[in-house]
Interface confidence: medium
Amino acid sequence: FKIETTPESRYLAQIGDSVSLTCSTTGCESPFFSWRTQIDSPLNGKVTNEGTTSTLTMNPVSFGNEHSYLCTATCESRKLEKGIQVEIYSFPKDPEIHLSGPLEAGKPITVKCSVADVYPFDRLEIDLLKGDHLMKSQEFLEDADRKSLETKSLEVTFTPVIEDIGKVLVCRAKLHIDEMDSVPTVRQAVKELQ
């Protein structure tokens, strides 16, 4: 007999979402299903069995659900197992740009770009651009093994010149979570210098 999971191997979910993992068999009329995490922590979900299909539902998903979930199907004396890695993220808001004061040519000003409620923040990269010019790029690699929503900021101090007035500041935040375009992994804020 065969075992299949939906999704096949990886589920990327935003914190607060409802997640359903499905395990099904072919070539076995009455399988016995069981679910566990790879490190045997609590499932934190509800299992529903119907014929040749078993579904594990976790609602809402949070840090405690970030595991590899293993579905085991037993058919008579034969056992098959398949895993689905559940990864969670949070990237709900566009960045915000704040200036330390009014813009004056020749007077240093600090630009702060903040991204709130991010997870996992070790995969966050923030770029601050003035027009087409990249002023600063920053990653947040430290303390990655911390399960929390955090605000991450980038700061740049520069001295504006007359030509800067009318230019735009762009804060672009990218959360490197998926190669596919299934989630909004890039967010940006724009502020005109005036």
């Epitope: 070790d122 990269e125 770029d127 790029s137 979570i177």
Partner: antibody, heavy 121, light 110 residues
Framework: QMQLVESGGGLVQPGGSLRLSCAAS????????VSWVRQAPGKGLEWVSR????????YYADSVKGRFTISRDNSKSTLYLQMNSLRAEDTAVYYC??????????????WGQGTLVTVSS | QLVLTQPPSVSAAPGQKVTISCSGS????????VSWYQHLPGTAPKLLIY???KRPSGIPDRFSGSKSGTSATLGIAGLQTGDDADYYC???????????FGTGAKVTVL
């Protein structure tokens, strides 16, 4: 299929320079921060340098700071390591390594075959 | 930058279980994810464990990882002759802004 192929190694005199390349294929190169890792003869693994996906952030081991420069060309899916003021202790097999996740400082699940750099007079 | 300490060598008979420790500090193991690698001479290192305790696909469940405070442990159960290799822990160090590997442990299957 995912592949990393290093090149550019060879014999160089102390004080000399060398540029290593790592050609990537089979994945979206620009999405990953990538690293150089080396192993000197009879020694353990030593992380050398890392560059973010955009190329905007770079990191170096203290032992190479000021002498080595990491860079990337995402249009060519290629990672580089410019090595200047080379010393005998830089003799090692140099690997480029890609993390398991798209960004971050996570574990390296994909490695090249390595290129040998020998610094000797 | 050798800030992660491992025992130089560990040995056991086939079928036995061995554990390899990796000791660090709050700036590395304490607050960052730990990975474990197997390295055979002349080959590229192979990732065994990531995020403290997760196995990449294709890695048998004989290999396990755990973390407690500023230390991490790799377990290898049902030891096989093919497990004869060097094993390294690795993590990011927030103080150094650098990735750090352990000193390495040689596993010998007797």
């Amino acid at each position: 299929q995912m592949q990393l192929v290093e090149s550019g190694g060879g014999l160089v005199q102390p004080g000399g320079s060398l540029r290593l390349s790592c050609a990537a294929s089979g994945f979206t190169f620009s999405s990953y921060g990538v690293s150089w890792v080396r192993q000197a003869p009879g020694k353990g693994l030593e992380w050398v340098s890392r560059i973010s996906g955009s190329g905007g952030s770079t990191y170096y081991a203290d032992s190479v700071k000021g002498r080595f420069t990491i860079s990337r060309d995402n249009s060519k899916s290629t990672l580089y390591l410019q090595m200047n003021s080379l010393r005998a202790e830089d003799t090692a097999v140099y690997y480029c390594a890609r993390p398991i996740f798209y960004g971050g400082n996570s574990a390296f699940d994909s490695w090249g075959q390595g290129t040998l750099v020998t610094v000797s007079s | 930058q050798l800030v992660l300490t491992q025992p130089p060598s560990v040995s056991a008979a086939p079928g036995q279980k061995v554990t390899i420790s990796c000791s660090g500090s709050s700036s590395n193991i304490g607050n960052n994810f730990v990975s474990w690698y197997q390295h055979l001479p002349g080959t590229a290192p192979k990732l065994l464990i990531y995020d403290n305790n997760k196995r990449p696909s294709g890695i048998p469940d004989r290999f396990s990882g755990s973390k407690s405070g500023t230390s991490a442990t790799l377990g290898i159960a049902g030891l096989q002759t093919g497990d004869d290799a060097d094993y390294y822990c690795g993590t990011w160090d927030s103080s150094l802004s650098a990735y750090v590997f352990g000193t390495g442990a040689k596993v010998t299957v007797l």
